[in-house]
């Protein structure tokens, strides 16, 4: 059975008496080899009580002395087997062995849980020689133990390629429970059960768990760690923590807030970034997400004209990047715009409505009923049309642009005329005889030039050449109807 020492035990003196077989009386070590500082802790365990020989790894030397007596087997003396102490206390333990003087260069190494302890550990080896044997004491001290010091410590000594291993010394560092898993903050659906987990370890074990919800204990009796709390559902935010208890005391986990998912708050600060004739770019600041990520947003657009039928256009978009270009709007129109966003619970209310206007655009249709005829007496071409519908002018009409293309014997010339907005007729001089004149008309607003009407052709019979201004871009020929007068 292993021997066990608790920290309440009175410390032994380091060297209570001479080693068996030792002739030395002053016990002053011949040689002391500190591996690190020689701190003397409050708690020490002496390895020097004489005991039965080590039953573990034993080296039996083959060499005999002058009298030819075989040497006894080499083994570490027994020491305390189990040391229990509290965190941050100091501890010192040691291994001792008597080695015949015929062996040179004996070194003792310390090992913990199968790994050699190297570097700046508080290890000291002391040698006490006499006539036949040298007593070697290897001490190991830890000034302030931590949980990581828990484990099984052994001494190893090499002699003649033989390895001598001591019995293990088990160090058990006890302290308050240590959390290995704590509850995590969560966002949960209202009235829906969910789980929280708490796990803590010693030593000492067992560790018992109490759950606390909003300062009230959930379980009246302790539950063994680990513990899973099934919360039967919440209607409002709650704070949870767990208490871990062992014989050393109590550790309380961090408190975690469990939030109830709700519909988002409405977006704020809807603003106009840019307006064109047929589109408005808006941005918004999302409201509080209700503890659930936004999924998408809906832009609602109403015509602000009191005479409109009040229908609402809805445009759906992703929640990011809080920006949307509303398209297919009428030019020079007023709109009310609101934004609503949704999460897994539902839609927010609509943001405060804002007013926005589209700008003037180029007309969307061409003048209608274009007619062209030749006035031979004045050598002019008369053009007449009807102005496009007001709705489709997309702005205030400032005039018309007339394109007339003259084609004759492979030569093509385009001329452009600007006409004021008041009329719906124009007269252009014949530029070439024995030629085809193709006429197209576009309405013009401050927003730009609208589409040209379908081409109308008229043939001008031979009469003689007339000088004309330099031509503009050639127009492609086409098979549109020709009007001959």
């Amino acid at each position: 059975a292993i021997t066990e020492a608790r920290e309440e035990a009175k410390p032994y003196p380091l060297f209570p008496g001479p080693f068996p077989g030792s002739l030395q009386t002053d016990h002053t070590p011949l040689l002391s080899l500190p591996h690190a500082s020689g701190y003397q802790p409050a708690l020490m365990f002496s390895p020097t009580q004489p005991g039965r020989p080590h039953t573990g790894n034993v080296a039996i030397p083959q060499v005999t002395s002058v009298e030819s007596k075989p040497l006894p087997p080499l083994a570490f003396k027994h020491t305390v087997g189990h040391i229990i102490l509290s965190e941050h206390k100091g501890v010192k333990f040691n291994c001792s062995i008597s080695v015949p003087n015929i062996y040179q260069d004996t070194t003792i190494s310390w090992w913990k849980d199968g790994k050699e302890l190297l570097g700046a550990h508080h290890a000291i080896t002391q040698f006490y020689p006499d006539d036949e044997v040298t007593a070697i004491i290897a001490s190991f001290s830890i000034t302030s133990v931590q949980r990581s010091d828990n484990g099984s410590y052994i001494c190893k000594m090499k002699i003649n390629n033989e390895e001598i291993v001591s019995d293990p010394i088990y160090i058990e560092v006890q302290g308050l429970p240590h959390f290995t898993k704590q509850p995590e903050s969560m966002n949960v659906t209202r009235n829906t059960a969910f789980n929280l987990t708490c796990q803590a370890v010693g030593p000492p074990e067992p560790v018992n768990i109490f759950w606390v919800q909003n300062s009230s204990r959930v379980n009246e009796q302790p539950e063994k760690s680990p513990s899973v709390l099934t919360v039967p559902g919440l209607t409002e935010m709650a704070v949870f923590s767990c208490e871990a208890h062992n014989d050393k005391g109590l550790t309380v986990s961090k408190g975690v807030q469990i939030n109830i998912k709700a519909i988002p708050s409405p977006p704020t600060e809807v603003s106009i970034r840019n307006s064109t004739a047929h589109s408005i770019l808006i941005s918004w600041v999302p409201g509080f997400d209700g503890y659930s990520p936004f999924r998408n947003c809906s832009i609602q657009v109403k015509e602000a004209d009191p005479l409109s039928n009040g229908s609402v256009m809805i445009f759906n978009t992703s929640a990011l990047p809080h920006l949307y270009q509303i398209k297919q709007l009428q030019a020079l129109a007023n709109y009310s715009i609101g934004v609503s966003c949704m999460n897994e619970i539902g839609w927010s209310a609509v943001s405060p409505w804002i007013l926005a206007s589209t700008t003037e655009g180029a007309p969307s249709v061409a003048p209608l009923n274009v007619t062209v005829f030749l006035n031979e007496s004045s050598d002019n071409v008369d053009i007449r049309w009807m102005k496009p519908p007001t709705k489709q002018q997309d702005g205030e009409l400032v005039g018309y642009r007339i394109s007339h293309v003259w084609q004759s014997a492979g030569i093509s010339k385009e001329l452009l005329e600007e006409v004021g907005q008041n009329g719906s007729r124009a007269r252009i001089s014949v530029q070439v005889h024995n030629a085809t004149c193709t006429v197209r008309i576009a309405a013009v607003t401050r927003g730009g030039v609208g589409p040209f009407s379908d081409p109308v052709k008229i043939f001008i019979p031979a009469h003689g050449w007339v000088d004309y201004a330099p031509s503009s871009t050639p127009a492609p020929g086409n098979a549109d109807p020709v009007l001959i007068i």
Partner: antibody, heavy 118, light 106 residues
Framework: QVQLVQSGSELKKPGASVKVSCKAS????????VHWVRQAPGQGLEWMGW????????TYAQGFTGRFVFSLDTSVSTAYLQISSLKAEDTAVYYC???????????WGQGTLVTVSS | EIVLTQSPATLSLSPGERATLSCRAS?????MHWYQQKPGQAPRPLIY???NLASGIPARFSGSGSGTSYTLTISSPEPEDFAVYYC?????????FGGGTKVEIK
Amino acid sequence: QVQLVQSGSELKKPGASVKVSCKASGYTFANYGVHWVRQAPGQGLEWMGWINTYQGEPTYAQGFTGRFVFSLDTSVSTAYLQISSLKAEDTAVYYCARGVRYAYMDYWGQGTLVTVSS
Amino acid sequence: EIVLTQSPATLSLSPGERATLSCRASSSVGYMHWYQQKPGQAPRPLIYATSNLASGIPARFSGSGSGTSYTLTISSPEPEDFAVYYCQQWSSNPRTFGGGTKVEIK
């Protein structure tokens, strides 16, 4: 299956003592507290307190301190309610119940009628 | 201590007529439990933690509420549902019961 079986009815004289037992079966006794609830004739339920079966520590509601004692014999998975110096107003049905999380009483004994009469 | 007030004290209903029982707490509580008791019997767990049906309880029973106001509803009471119903709070010691609501046949 979980069961709480209480001792039988008692007729006592004022000033006497009574000990009501509540034997648990079908679960690990030390894992759940035992609550005691009183119901006077024609009245509602009144929580008297509970005993921690893990540590043996009792908790008493106001009005149930002094003459009322909760105790345990864990070797036989039994909780006890002892009332000393009985008075007429102690006449009631006494229930034991198993307590789980959130102080919910999920299993109840059948009740023990204690009658105090001279 | 938290005082629980149940209303009405008595509820007279015809079978099938919806029953709504109220339990008000003198201060906010975390959860409310409900128990049913018939004459000469021990209380029977009905609803755990405000809205969770106890084992074997039919779905015509439901619970709701939060803060200081809690409700037990029997959507269409059967003859065996005529009994006394008690609420019990979880939040702070001492655990307290309401005074009870008796549901009787009209």
